[in-house]
């Protein structure tokens, strides 16, 4: 909680730059048609771009990026019974960002 | 890109953490009424809980929260000409997360 | 329920630009590719853009590279696709889909499109 | 770039008949083959994907078969709502490619 006596800091920009989020691994990514399973893990952790640039014409993308294969259990639910399977999910990780313009408007010649 | 040797390893699950979030400065946190101005930065680094749980019945939640004031540039432009001010903006930072039970809709009495 | 909606089509003069957008909703839009397959007035389907989960991986066929730019804000659920130097030839009905887990899937989802006509 | 042809372009079927349409790839594609249904003003509907496997909610009289390069999507008994036009893609490599179409009318 906030002390009556806390300052203000000035803010900091968060700046363009790789960090870590939370990517959920959807049953859809696995099996489009069957419901009937479980995918352990249910979420990962990625490295991707994020923070803001100088202006809105600028945004933050990544410049280099890496796919990496995970293997997660696909756990089938038969006759009230686990089985369990493997499967492989491809991750997206960011290496490297880049304040890059927005692919804007361009003039009519 | 992907080496063709490429091994799936085990996906390992994103734990229920505080991670490092991006928070955009909305110029209506500002000020509701008026659009005639910009803020720095625009975007600032929080802590926020984030990842998963063993079941679907459980949610990554903060069990402790601060706040914490920032002080930010509100840049008005008068006749074409920026006119510096300050603004604080009142920050949420996810200080420790839990696995929580999700509340069940309760049934109608 | 799984829902796409596209927006931004309209008349532009040939040489011009527009910005199109699709505002997903009901699925982990983050999770997931996403495409551009346009449809012009009584032709076939055309397979335009397509872009990775992250945003960082992008494929054009020959017709539109350098032209078009698809792109994504996961946090908003939202993809564009801006169309630079229009032709007569873009006049199209444009669709977005949602296209798995890599670029080699099949499209799952679609929205109901949203018409661009370049003439002068 | 992969080329995919659909043959016949256009068929006229009645109600209750069993309809084949082939389609066709300029090299192998493996099973990355995929088949879509799409009526007049609508978007197209995922029907087959993997060139046999039943996309959910599709009903069981539609099937596909094949690979490699020749495949076939069967309407085993075509029903009023089936009057519509049916594409073949490869997803197996960029650029993706769809087939030209055919339309299944009512004789």
């Known amino acids: 909680s906030l002390g009556s006596l806390t300052v203000a800091e000035p803010a900091m920009i968060a700046e363009c730059k790789t960090r870590t989020e939370v990517f959920e691994i959807s049953r859809r990514l696995i099996d489009r048609t069957n419901a009937n399973f479980l995918v352990w893990p249910p979420c990962v952790e990625v490295q991707r771009c994020s923070g803001c640039c100088n202006n809105r014409n600028v945004q933050c993308r990544p410049t280099q990026v890496q796919l990496r294969p995970v293997q997660v259990r696909k756990i089938e639910i038969v006759r009230k019974k686990p089985i369990f399977k493997k499967a492989t999910v491809t991750l997206e990780d960011h290496l490297a960002c880049k304040c890059e313009t927005v692919a804007a408007a361009r003039p009519v010649t | 890109s992907l080496g063709s040797l490429t091994v799936a390893e085990p996906a390992m699950i994103a734990e229920c953490k505080t991670r490092t979030e991006v928070f955009e400065i909305s110029r209506r946190l500002i000020d509701r009424t008026n659009a005639n101005f910009l803020v720095w930065p625009p975007c600032v680094e929080v802590q926020r809980c984030s990842g998963c749980c063993n079941n679907r019945n459980v949610q990554c939640r903060p069990t402790q929260v601060q706040l914490r004031p920032v002080q930010v540039r509100k840049i008005e432009i008068v006749r074409k000409k920026p006119i510096f001010k300050k603004a604080t903006v009142t920050l949420e930072d996810h200080l420790a997360c839990k696995c929580e039970t999700v509340a069940a809709a309760r049934p109608v009495t | 329920e799984v829902q796409l909606v596209e927006s931004g089509g309209g008349l532009v003069q040939p040489g011009g630009s527009l910005r199109l957008s699709c505002a997903a909703s009901?699925?982990?839009?983050?999770?997931?590719?996403m495409t551009w397959v346009r449809q012009a007035p009584g032709k076939g389907l055309e397979w335009v853009a397509s872009?990775?989960?992250?945003?960082?991986?992008?494929h054009y066929p020959d017709s539109v590279k350098d032209r078009f730019t698809v792109s994504r804000d996961n946090a908003k659920n939202s993809l564009y696709l801006q169309l630079n130097s229009l032709r007569a030839e873009d006049t199209a009905v444009y669709y977005c889909?949602?296209?798995?887990?890599?670029?080699?899937?099949?499209?799952?989802?679609w929205g109901q499109g949203t018409l661009v006509t370049v003439s002068s | 770039d992969i080329q995919m042809t659909q043959s016949p372009s256009s068929l006229s079927a009645s109600v209750g008949d069993r309809v084949t349409i082939t389609c066709r790839a300029s090299?192998?594609?493996?099973?990355?083959l995929n088949w879509y249904q799409q009526k007049p003003g609508k978007a197209p509907k995922l029907l087959i994907y993997?060139?046999?496997s039943l996309q959910s909610g599709v009903p069981s009289r539609f099937s596909g078969s094949g690979s490699g390069t020749d495949f076939t999507l069967t309407i085993s008994s075509l029903q009023p709502e089936d009057f519509a036009t049916y594409y073949c893609?490869?997803?197996?490599?960029?650029?993706?490619?769809f087939g030209g179409g055919t339309k299944v009318e009512i004789k």
């Open positions: 009901g699925f982990t839009f983050s999770s997931f590719w």
């Open positions: 090299q192998s594609i493996s099973n990355y």
């Open positions: 889909a949602e296209s798995g887990g890599d670029i080699y899937s099949d499209f799952d989802y």
């Open positions: 872009i990775s989960a992250g945003g960082g991986i992008t």
């Open positions: 993997a060139a046999s």
């Open positions: 893609q490869q997803s197996y490599s960029t650029p993706l490619t």
